[in-house]
Interface confidence: low
């Protein structure tokens, strides 16, 4: 008995071939001997089976002695043995229809679980193997679960169902909803405008939800909500914004925030959360702001940074085109009685300059100029 595997919702074509290469009488029946379809001369006739509207054949092939049964929009319950009667002989084909679905929405938040459920006909014992977009293989029976979805799990999952040495392949598109970066850091000199960007790692046309940026300034004892906003389709509308600092927000995606100026009191870290409509849980992105200030007070030239710096970052003060006068793994460095000229304050990581501020030291009778 020939075995054919089909996919729920698809179309299958069961073949039946006569030895005579001409149009002769044929019938397709199911295992209950109920006629599905056949011919009367050049006409297609249909029987009382439940397949009625979904069953068809290819009249163009009858003259070649081919009498296929086409079943459209396959259902699991179409799984059966189909019998083709032609030339006093019977050809039996066993059709097994499988369905594979994500038992939740195919748009899932990062960290959530994905469960794939296999629908199969009674009596079948299929095995399933799925390959994620990043090449990870998972195997299972009727259900497969993947916990803690990551950004790289976004894309097409290819699942192969194996039964009677035959296989059928399913493709399921999974979208992991997340920000492109889990964390970002912005380095700014005092007084500069600050741009924060929160690009999403997915594109869906209809994106509705609400969000908030909570900020923990290094100098503050508690965190504070800086801005709340709504998202409707690709449109962002600000609900509430603090007066100090007065953030500005772009009206379209990607989410974009502008801080009018960097100040030591703003240095710290923030957490932008985005709650999407019809989704449990929230998307998160951490953002950090490091602010640098160089000042000269009387005979003391000082450079300071505020915000979440790593212990390996180096802060240096040097006279332009000269060796560093002072270099420390600290958040403040200073030089007493600095000589006149253009001084540079540098924040660097393994030799790479992250932030630079220049201050001009004038001869002792003048006041300093900050460019």
């Amino acid at each position: 008995k020939k075995v054919v595997l089909g996919k729920k919702g698809d179309t299958v074509e069961l073949t039946c071939t006569a030895s005579q290469k001409k149009s002769i009488q044929f019938h397709w029946k199911n295992s209950n001997q109920i006629k599905i379809l056949g011919n009367q001369g050049s006409f297609l006739t249909k029987g009382p089976s439940k397949l009625n509207d979904r069953a068809d054949s290819r009249r163009s092939l009858w003259d070649q002695g081919n009498f296929p049964l086409i079943i459209k929009n396959l259902k699991i319950e179409d799984s059966d043995t189909y019998i083709c009667e032609v030339e006093d002989q019977k050809e039996e084909v066993q059709l097994l229809v499988f369905g594979l679905t994500a038992n939740s929405d195919t748009h899932l938040l990062q960290g959530q679980s994905l469960t794939l459920t296999l629908e199969s006909p009674p009596g079948s014992s299929p095995s399933v193997q799925c390959r994620s977009p990043r090449g990870k293989n998972i195997q299972g029976g009727k259900t497969l679960s993947v916990s803690q979805l990551e950004l790289q799990d976004s894309g097409t999952w290819t699942c192969t169902v194996l039964q009677n040495q035959k296989k059928v392949e399913f493709k399921i598109d999974i979208v992991v909803l997340a920000f492109q970066k889990a964390s970002s850091i912005v380095y700014k000199k005092e007084g500069e405008q600050v741009e924060f960007s929160f690009p999403l790692a997915f594109t869906v046309e209809k994106l509705t939800g609400s969000g908030e940026l909570w900020w923990q300034a290094e100098r503050a004892s508690s965190s504070k909500s800086w801005i709340t906003f709504d998202l409707k389709n690709k449109e962002v509308s600000v609900k509430r914004v603090t007066q100090d600092p007065k953030l500005q927000m772009g009206k379209k995606l990607p989410l974009h925030l502008t801080l009018p100026q960097a100040l030591p009191q703003y240095a710290g870290s923030g957490n932008l959360t985005l709650a999407l409509e019809a989704k449990t849980g929230k998307l998160h992105q951490e953002v950090n702001l490091v602010v640098m200030r160089a000042t000269q007070l009387q005979k003391n030239l000082t450079c300071e940074v505020w915000g979440p710096t790593s212990p390996k970052l180096m802060l240096s003060l040097k006279l332009e085109n000269k060796e560093a006068k002072v270099s420390k793994r600290e958040k403040a460095v200073w030089v007493l009685n600095p000589e006149a000229g253009m001084w540079q304050c540098l924040l660097s990581d393994s030799g790479q300059v992250l932030l630079e501020s220049n201050i001009k030291v004038l001869p002792t009778w003048s006041t300093p100029v900050q460019p």
Epitope: Q180, S197, P199, T203, E205, K206, K232, N233, K234, E235, P254
Partner: antibody, heavy 118, light 111 residues
Framework: QVQLVQSGAEVKKPGASVKVSCKAS????????IHWVRQATGQGLEWIGE????????YSNSKFKDRVTITADKSTNTAYMELRSLRSDDTAVYFC???????????WGQGTLVTVSS | DIVLTQSPASLAVSPGQRATITCKAG??????????MNWYQQKPGQPPKLLIY???NLESGIPSRFSGSGSGTDFTLTINPVEENDTATYYC?????????FGPGTKVEIK
């Protein structure tokens, strides 16, 4: 399949208004932005503006800001582009378009020729 | 506004040869690793047809003879090999910021 079908050609006098329609089918109308683009005979393409059919929020090219109104009727899956105070240099084929999966306009209406002549 | 310039204005290529069209943007159209530049083909009396989106992604159903490259402000559309029915005008378009803008077009003729 996705289809955008536009209204027929129009002949207008200078100073008049024209309203071109674009009927969408084959997808959920409120899910996608409808854009309007025009092309004068033998010339290049010029973006007029866009509408979010779900919210009715419209954005237009500042060049047309005072003269263009883009609207959408969710009940009929139709977007409209109205251009007022027509001038002879508004003579062009007006297209509606929709994004595909990427950022480009993958689906276009057949175009509506608007002729402005005294 | 971002202005796009295309070169050459017109181009005559023999079948089987390579055609290269460039598009220059007045400012960078890059955002977070993606370049928001698209390419279209337009034949007389027809609406434009999307060939390439986000600088290098081939639109579904478009032959692999068409390819796009570039980032920042400089982009290229390549047709290799050119076929008879590639006679058309080709436009670049930025979808980085409003107002969205198209290049002036490059007319490609098959010799």
């Amino acid at each position: 399949q996705v289809q955008l079908v536009q209204s027929g050609a129009e002949v207008k006098k200078p100073g008049a208004s024209v309203k071109v329609s674009c009927k969408a089918s084959g997808y959920t109308f409120t899910d996608y932005v409808i854009h309007w683009v025009r092309q004068a005979t033998g010339q290049g393409l010029e973006w007029i503006g866009e509408i979010y059919p779900g919210s009715g929020s419209a954005y237009s090219n500042s060049k047309f800001k005072d003269r263009v109104t883009i609207t959408a009727d969710k009940s009929t899956n139709t977007a409209y582009m109205e251009l007022r105070s027509l001038r002879s240099d508004d003579t062009a084929v007006y297209f509606c378009a929709r994004r595909g999966n990427g950022t480009g306009f993958a689906y276009w209406g057949q175009g509506t020729l608007v002729t402005v002549s005294s | 506004d971002i202005v796009l310039t295309q070169s050459p204005a017109s181009l005559a290529v023999s079948p089987g040869q390579r055609a290269t069209i460039t598009c220059k943007a007045g400012q960078s159209v890059d955002y977070d690793g993606d370049s928001y530049m698209n390419w279209y083909q337009q034949k007389p009396g027809q609406p434009p047809k999307l060939l390439i989106y986000v600088a290098s992604n081939l639109e579904s159903g478009i032959p692999s003879r068409f390819s796009g490259s570039g980032s920042g402000t400089d982009f290229t559309l390549t047709i290799n090999p050119v076929e008879e029915n590639d006679t058309a005008t080709y436009y670049c378009q930025q979808s980085y910021k409003d107002p969205l803008a198209f290049g002036p077009g490059t007319k490609v003729e098959i010799k």
